[in-house]
Amino acid sequence: AGVFELQIHSFGPGPGPGAPRSPCSARLPCRLFFRVCLKPGLSEEAAESPCALGAALSARGPVYTEQPGAPAPDLPLPDGLLQVPFRDAWPGTFSFIIETWREELGDQIGGPAWSLLARVAGRRRLAAGGPWARDIQRAGAWELRFSYRARCEPPAVGTACTRLCRPRSAPSRCGPGLRPCAPLEDECEAPLVCRAGCSPEHGFCEQPGECRCLEGWTGPLCTVPVSTSSCLSPRGPSSATTGCLVPGPGPCDGNPCANGGSCSETPRSFECTCPRGFYGLRCEVSGVTCADGPCFNGGLCVGGADPDSAYICHCPPGFQGSNCEKRVDRCSLQPCRNGGLCLDLGHALRCRCRAGFAGPRCEHDLDDCAGRACANGGTCVEGGGAHRCSCALGFGGRDCRERADPCAARPCAHGGRCYAHFSGLVCACAPGYMGARCEFPVHPDGASALPAAPPGLRPGDPQRYL
């Protein structure tokens, strides 16, 4: 387990001519906030695919009102880091999406209107526990500067946060077979053990007490083969000749529930109803108390002071089950109305509303967008009684019908050649220059002129520029 941390340093106009208009005005003051979405691996998935590693939303930035006639400056930012906790191992390679959102503070019906101002995405390699990595990304005429890192939460350590450490019991050395935990040399590695009963063939874990299934297996203990679509029977071992699943014993056959528990089949496996004083998947555990730490995912244990009395886990938001072991998919309840996109950010739900709707659950119909379509993927934004379009990359105009030439503003510095690309533009730099816009000269000694260190980093600190 650990935390991915993102520090936004600046969001404002990119270099070169064609500076964007300020997103806020005297009539429509606004403030910015950011959303980060993380996915494991070097995925090329669509922006709307699940943020499997996690997502986070920043606080709102200070209210900003454009000064008439002034160019858009770097916009005021929210305080603090965006933090995305991850429960499992850090994958090492990941994809990110960072969205800059504008919250308009005019007197809209149903509260403030949100619109997406810019979206940047990338794929990176990053070891947990390393220094801050620095990045610059551009979306249209906007430029976003940020740093990020992944760090493990104790007791996890290592580049993937898969090793567990615990304080040494003796000052001299760790027990047999247990290594000191670099860089925490005063701590010792602790064993990681999966949930009791997790199949040794088909299950593994990256958190104590969990059971994750290898491909082709399912169920709480990874003992149930996944059905193949070409076969009728959902159970049993695979037939070597057909590759299909042949009928096998049911999950309750032979009653897997110990100590007088009663078994009932579930769609994916079985469930035991245990008599008083027994707990666990198969009622195999007796006398569990709060001292045994039975509540997962930060659940609060109450009662159970003596082995004969049951404990109760009070689960934090987002988790349920008798031991808070199940993650709640709060979006499955479809809380966003009118076709809004549901975002489960862990600490809160957010609805991203379709054009023409607003409100925390997209419950407000904004009439001024009704029947007024924005072309080429643009989003209609309610704006004080008049419809406006927030256009997708590469388009402009009132209704996003005008194709914008991303190279028209000559964005490539130092003689770099500009090529229009479906996702924006690409610069081919002249010899001796580098960077997304050819803005950095390559020094003869091999170093490059790079931007200054982010706040909190001294120039001498180790850092990485991507």
Epitope: V193, C194, C198, E206
Partner: antibody
Framework: QITLKESGPTLVKPTQTLTLTCTFS??????????VGWIRQPPGKALEWLAL???????RYSPSLQTRLTITKDTPKNQVVLTMTNMDPVDTATYYC????????????WGRGTLVTVSS | EIVLTQSPATLSLSPGERATLSCRAS??????LAWYQQKPGQAPRLLIY???YRATGIPARFSGSGSGTDFTLTISSLEPEDFAVYYC?????????FGQGTRLEIK
Amino acid sequence: QITLKESGPTLVKPTQTLTLTCTFSGFSLSTRGVGVGWIRQPPGKALEWLALIYWNDDKRYSPSLQTRLTITKDTPKNQVVLTMTNMDPVDTATYYCARSNWGNWYFALWGRGTLVTVSS
Amino acid sequence: EIVLTQSPATLSLSPGERATLSCRASQSVSSYLAWYQQKPGQAPRLLIYDAFYRATGIPARFSGSGSGTDFTLTISSLEPEDFAVYYCQHRSNWPITFGQGTRLEIK
């Protein structure tokens, strides 16, 4: 179907280094959660765990033999290699490789084993 | 390291009888204990894991019980193919260790 097969020399001289290879099929060490380990068994004696390596290159060694053992993997070749330095006649044993999943430190699937004799 | 002590060293029984094998840990291993069966010239085979869960394809006559430091493998009615050496192994801590084995032989 998962199979594991050990290969290497059958006879090693004292002080020499033993190199054993486990070649497996039916799974990949690029799969998250998967590992391969080595266990040995002197003739007529008990099993002794030696080393483990996992998909994320995490390596575990028996503390009593840690200074003599090195375990590595060649993921594209579906192979795990164990080297054991400074061999001694007491290291005469059948050496097995077996699959073990991360956090689930049992050995569900085994190779047939290879007998290594240490003698001058 | 955790030491696993198996008893008896040798158990002589006849087919159809009930066999009870013991494994004792030098400190608690919770329920994280497995049993393996090994026949002459063959690799060990996982029978029971986490004290009482039967591995894939293991007949119902094999059962396990116990937790903490004392564990038992029971074979309810011995078949001729059950005569072999049985080992216990824990997974609760590093290093992984095995017991010294119990030989189950035909009386």
